[in-house]
């Protein structure tokens, strides 16, 4: 009955500080409403990065000020996190909750290590 969530082990953010990864879950039930949360784990502290609830077949809607965007297709969610800096390097965990109809199910991935490298400033041209 437990829900399995799969996500890539490692992702390298682009030079513009954008990282994308797929979060896939094996649904044990016929959920119509799903909540996806991205958590960041650093030094055993877990914080919420962003979250969205969506109806199956509809698009994910994150809050306007969220650093996350995403699309869904079946039991797969494509997540994009933007505005990342080198200090944001860390483990990003995909958490999936099947909210409705009951029963509720929780699934937590093993995390994606996102590496962010700040771009080198362009040298001054003479």
């Amino acid at each position: 009955k437990a829900m399995h969530v799969a996500q890539p082990a490692v992702v390298l953010a682009s030079s513009r500080g954008i990282a994308s990864f797929v979060c896939e879950y094996a649904s044990p039930g016929k959920a119509t409403e799903v909540r996806v949360t991205v958590l960041r784990q650093a030094d055993s502290q877990v914080t919420e990065v962003c979250a969205a609830t969506y109806m199956m077949g509809n698009e994910l809607t994150f809050l306007d000020d969220s650093i996350c965007t995403g699309t869904s297709s079946g039991n797969q969610v494509n997540l994009t996190i933007q505005g990342l800096r080198a200090m944001d390097t860390g483990l990003y965990i995909c958490k999936v909750e099947l909210m409705y109809p009951p029963p509720y199910y929780l699934g937590i991935g093993n995390g994606t290590q996102i590496y962010v490298i700040d771009p080198e400033p362009c040298p001054d041209s003479d």
Epitope: L39, V46, T47, M99, P103, Y105, L106
Partner: antibody, heavy 122, light 107 residues
């Protein structure tokens, strides 16, 4: 300091016909209450823990144990940082200490209140 | 509903000894399992989540292991304050369920 404080427990007489009612409250402080799902868990005297009800952060999703479905109603007021449990048609078997508990980001119940005693006597 | 069975019901040990508590699920709960400690007259306290991750502020003498249906809580060297009742809980699906508890008492 992260804290949950329950109140509203007491003695209720189980009458012939529909039982009595009681409303429990749980005041939260020290964290962003509106970001967390919350639960009620109870413990009958000398017994183990039994989950009663759960409510999502925005009250959109609510779940009940079969033993209380149709009799108990969970609710919350994020503006007041408060969680509630309205208990109707109380029975002797509802006698227990009632705890409110926060659902941590990783799923377990990470913060608990000290509990409030509800006694239903015939 | 997921049924969690804890064993033994009571464990009689002396301070300094090792305690091994078991929790068995009726079907797989993956690693969505937590352990709680409860002392008389107090609320439960989260010790372990995700089967093996210690909660904030929990001493390293407490450790958890297992996945699927069989889980273990180990207390390496019992301190006087560790004598209490321990509950396991699955939180992977509703209804959320607890084991019946294991009492660790002073021998």
């Amino acid at each position: 300091e992260v804290q949950l404080v329950e109140s509203g427990g007491g003695l209720v007489k189980e009458l012939l016909g529909p039982g009595g009612s009681l409303r429990l409250s749980c005041a939260a402080s020290g964290f962003t209450f509106s970001s967390y799902s919350m639960n009620w868990v109870r413990q009958a005297p000398g017994k183990g823990l039994e989950w009663v009800s759960s409510i999502s952060s925005s009250s959109s999703y609510i779940y009940y144990a079969d033993s209380v479905k149709g009799r108990f109603t969970i609710s919350r007021d994020n503006a007041k940082n408060s969680l509630y449990l309205q208990m109707n048609s109380l029975r002797a078997e509802d006698t227990a200490v009632y705890y409110c508990a926060r659902v941590g980001l990783m799923g377990p119940f990470d913060i608990w209140g000290q509990g409030t005693m509800v006694t239903v006597s015939s | 509903n997921e049924v969690l069975t804890q064993s033994p019901g009571t464990l009689s040990l002396s301070p300094g000894e090792r305690a091994t508590l078991s929790c068995r699920a009726s079907q797989s709960v993956s690693r969505y399992l937590g352990w709680y400690q409860q002392k008389p007259g107090q609320a439960p306290r989260l010790l372990i989540y995700g089967a093996s991750t210690r909660a904030t502020g929990i001493p390293d003498r407490f450790s958890g292991s297992g996945s699927g249906t069989d889980f273990t809580l180990t207390i390496t060297r019992l301190e006087p304050e560790d004598f209490a009742v321990y509950y396991c809980q699955q939180y992977g699906s509703s209804p959320w369920t607890f084991g019946q508890g294991t009492k660790v008492e002073i021998k």
